[in-house]
């Protein structure tokens, strides 16, 4: 994991200050209000998945 100010997070992930690590943009459909999702705006939005039965 990268710290802020060093190498950027790998492709498809974004830095989370809340969690202090790079996080996967793929988790943003389920957790859209996560701080790191702002850094995932360039990725095409995935439709919301059926997490609630």
């Amino acid at each position: 994991e990268q710290a802020p100010g060093t190498a950027p997070c790998s492709r498809g992930s974004s830095w989370s200050a809340d969690l202090d690590k790079c996080m996967d943009c793929a988790s943003c459909p389920a957790r859209p209000h996560s701080d790191f999702c702002l850094g995932c705006a360039a990725a095409p939005p995935a439709p919301f998945r059926l997490l609630w039965p």
């Epitope: 809340d18 969690l19 793929a26 988790s27 459909p29 389920a30 957790r31 095409p44 995935a46 998945r49």
Partner: antibody, heavy 119, light 111 residues
Framework: EVKLGESGGGLVQPGGSMKLSCVAS????????MNWVRQSPEKGLEWVAE??????????HYAESAKGRFTISRDDSRSSVYLQMNNLRAEDTAIYYC??????????WGQGTSVTVSS | DIVLTQSPASLAVSLGQRATISCKAS??????????MQWYQQRPGQSPKLLIK???KLDSGVPARFSGSGSGTDFTLNIHPVEEEDTATYYC?????????FGGGTRLEIK
């Protein structure tokens, strides 16, 4: 270092109750959904229950086999998650693991606690 | 519920060779952007450990000899070259919807 410690397992008779506990450390507990997953030779790995965050009003979800019998809860002040199991059946015999997930991946697993339901 | 079918149930691979494990889902677990499929390793007597997330992304600290691929309903875990420490059972798991389900596991033995 992430640590997850399950406890509370043991031998219980059919129809009985048991409460499992899991104490977590090494990650921001309040930001992670928490799961219970069980493993038996007969059914393999089987997701049991999930509890989300305070901001989600601690929403809970259950596998069909757990609905109406099991209750998942969490205490953020103690970084702990619990599984209250009632009306236990022989098919509930398994090793029970707690595991945090941010959204999709069960990032860490404890050592598990063994539950045996038998007369 | 989404059913995950793994094959083979077990395999024996010579040290240094390639191990290939398949996981087929009963419905698609992918969008145009992401695949919601994970792989876990469980060594004998141990708890499961996350290896690969979102079909192809290695978890932190996982050696590069592990790789995942696939989308839709067909996914593959490859290990090359296999090492002694890879003796374990491997499970796929989807996070497309609730309930989360796991494959039945593939036991890998190193010859």
């Amino acid at each position: 270092e992430v640590k997850l410690g399950e406890s509370g397992g043991g031998l219980v008779q059919p129809g009985g109750s048991m409460k499992l506990s899991c104490v977590a450390s090494g990650f921001p507990f309040t930001k992670y959904w928490m799961n219970w997953v069980r493993q038996s030779p007969e059914k393999g790995l089987e997701w049991v229950a999930e509890i989300r965050l305070k901001s989600d009003n601690y929403a809970t979800h259950y596998a069909e086999s757990a609905k109406g019998r099991f209750t998942i809860s969490r205490d953020d002040s103690r970084s702990s998650v619990y599984l209250q199991m009632n009306n236990l059946r022989a098919e509930d015999t398994a090793i029970y693991y707690c595991s945090p997930t941010y959204a999709d991946t069960m990032d860490y697993w404890g050592q598990g606690t063994s539950v045996t339901v038998s007369s | 519920d989404i059913v995950l079918t793994q094959s083979p149930a077990s395999l024996a691979v010579s040290l240094g060779q390639r191990a290939t494990i398949s996981c087929k889902a009963s419905q698609s677990v992918s969008t145009s952007t992401y695949s919601y499929m994970q792989w876990y390793q469980q060594r004998p007597g141990q708890s499961p450990k996350l290896l690969i997330k979102y079909a192809s992304k290695l978890d932190s600290g996982v050696p590069a000899r592990f790789s995942g691929s696939g989308s839709g309903t067909d996914f593959t875990l490859n290990i090359h070259p296999v090492e002694e420490e890879d003796t374990a059972t491997y499970y796929c798991q989807h996070s497309w919807e609730l309930p989360y389900t796991f494959g039945g596991g593939t036991r890998l033995e190193i010859k």
